[in-house]
Amino acid sequence: QKSSIEKCSVDIQQSRNKTTERPGLLNCPIYWQQLREKCLLFSHTVNPWNNSLADCSTKESSLLLIRDKDELIHTQNLIRDKAILFWIGLNFSLSEKNWKWINGSFLNSNDLEIRGDAKENSCISISQTSVYSEYCSTEIRWICQKELTPVRNKVYPDS
Amino acid sequence: QKSSIEKCSVDIQQSRNKTTERPGLLNCPIYWQQLREKCLLFSHTVNPWNNSLADCSTKESSLLLIRDKDELIHTQNLIRDKAILFWIGLNFSLSEKNWKWINGSFLNSNDLEIRGDAKENSCISISQTSVYSEYCSTEIRWICQKELTPVRNKVYPDS
């Protein structure tokens, strides 16, 4: 029996013989749509932001993270109705007084032109044409993402 | 050029030639440790519970969900230091006055013996020996999980 110290909370020894490539998805599952190197799931039903975050998490995916304006536009092109809003993985951090992605990075102010206030309990939604600040308790649709292609030597350090 | 309606927010037609099998992980990525049919990542840095939930999500994983006492014990055996606490995917639902897993299910009271209060802004952490209720704003380590084995025809229902 190994001691708990030898076991170690992250037993890298075990992983020595394992792939350092994240297997990833080779294809998008049913209900998910491919957009470049991601699979996206556009929900039909609605949830507050927190529940949307949890739903994506239980699907082993993430609320949508948008890299730049180009990715925003390509995502918006997949939204079929002007009136529909979708939560993405961006909300207002009161302590840092800034918009923060759920991966811990801050919004580059050039990336998204947000309509609405930057204040406590504000979360970001996108529509076919715009980006909005909404109360996080609002029930709207949401977008989950999974990375599609295998990513080599991506080791998921702490955010 | 397809109309936005034909593109549809989730164009399942594209997925027709794609697998309906969720590929899953065949091996745990580096830094993750296998425990039965799961890969676990024990963080080294600390975060409030909400940020921990978000971090797991961006890693396309979930805060740890514990099925029963047996799984709890096996997980605790991997914790190397008695003094370290780790967030798991369980918090107090004020509206339902009950402990709730992030997949929406309620805690079976026999599963975990929780030390501390069941009240607003309480989240659950585990140590090498115990299960604690802590203020969700407390910055401690956390555990993410990924399912290891491929699951056929799983369109991501309940965990």
Partner: antibody, heavy 121, light 107 residues
């Protein structure tokens, strides 16, 4: 195993009211939008109403709008349908139904056995 | 509202036959179509989701195809337990709507 069990049906006069319940088990009820679907004797299926997972958003078929109210109690894993101003054409078996995925309103992979509502004088 | 028109409304067939049922939507619904089987006195049972996804536990003799407005449910070799009524359902837009049903009877 997912189980949905409807109750509350029965005979009621036109203009009367009934409250249907659906007790859910075997899945995390509160992650899913839920629906009521009905089937008149010898007829096809008709979607009646849906409610979001949290319960703040409700949707209705035009035929019942303003008369029926859908609600849920996630702490009791129970779905409800309050039916007022009932008409003869509301006579049907009422099913509660769960969607296959938590992101969907429909594609129902679990149904109750149904409860019969008869509106007649 | 989106109308779904099923054809035929009934079909007589023998065990072993190949049976095809069609469902036409009044406007494009991408692949947001499901198929159900219902037997007398029973609740419907999901067979196919997302136009072509076979629901877990459903025999592989059932298959679905189509996209946009025209969809097909095929039973490759009819079995005695397949005699029932079949419904299509669209989930692309609310209100959710069902087709009128196709009754598969013994010849």
């Amino acid at each position: 195993e997912v189980q949905l069990l409807e109750s509350g049906g029965g005979l009621v006069q036109p203009g009367g009211s009934l409250r249907l319940s659906c007790a859910a088990s075997g899945f995390t009820f509160e992650r899913y939008a839920m629906s009521w679907v009905r089937q008149a004797p010898g007829k096809g299926l008709e979607w009646v109403s849906a409610i979001s997972a949290v319960g703040g958003t409700t949707k209705y078929a035009d035929s019942v709008k303003g008369r029926f109210t859908i609600s849920r109690d996630n702490s009791k894993n129970t779905l409800y349908l309050q039916m007022n101003s009932l008409r003869a054409e509301d006579t049907a078996v009422y099913y509660c139904a769960k969607p296959l995925d938590s992101s969907l309103w429909a594609d129902f992979d679990a149904w109750g056995r149904g409860t019969l509502v008869t509106v007649s004088s | 509202d989106i109308q779904l028109t099923q054809s035929p409304s009934s079909v007589s067939a023998s065990v072993g036959d190949r049976v095809t049922i069609t469902c036409r939507a009044s406007q494009g619904i991408s692949s947001w179509l499901a198929w159900y089987q219902q037997k007398p006195g029973k609740a419907p049972k999901l067979l196919i989701y997302a136009a072509s996804g076979l629901q877990s536990g459903v025999p592989s003799r059932f298959s679905g195809s189509g996209s946009g407005t025209d969809f097909t449910l095929t039973i490759s070799s009819l079995q005695p337990e397949d005699f029932a009524t079949y419904y299509c359902q669209q989930a692309s837009y609310l209100p959710i709507t069902f087709g009128g049903g196709t009754k598969v009877e013994i010849k």
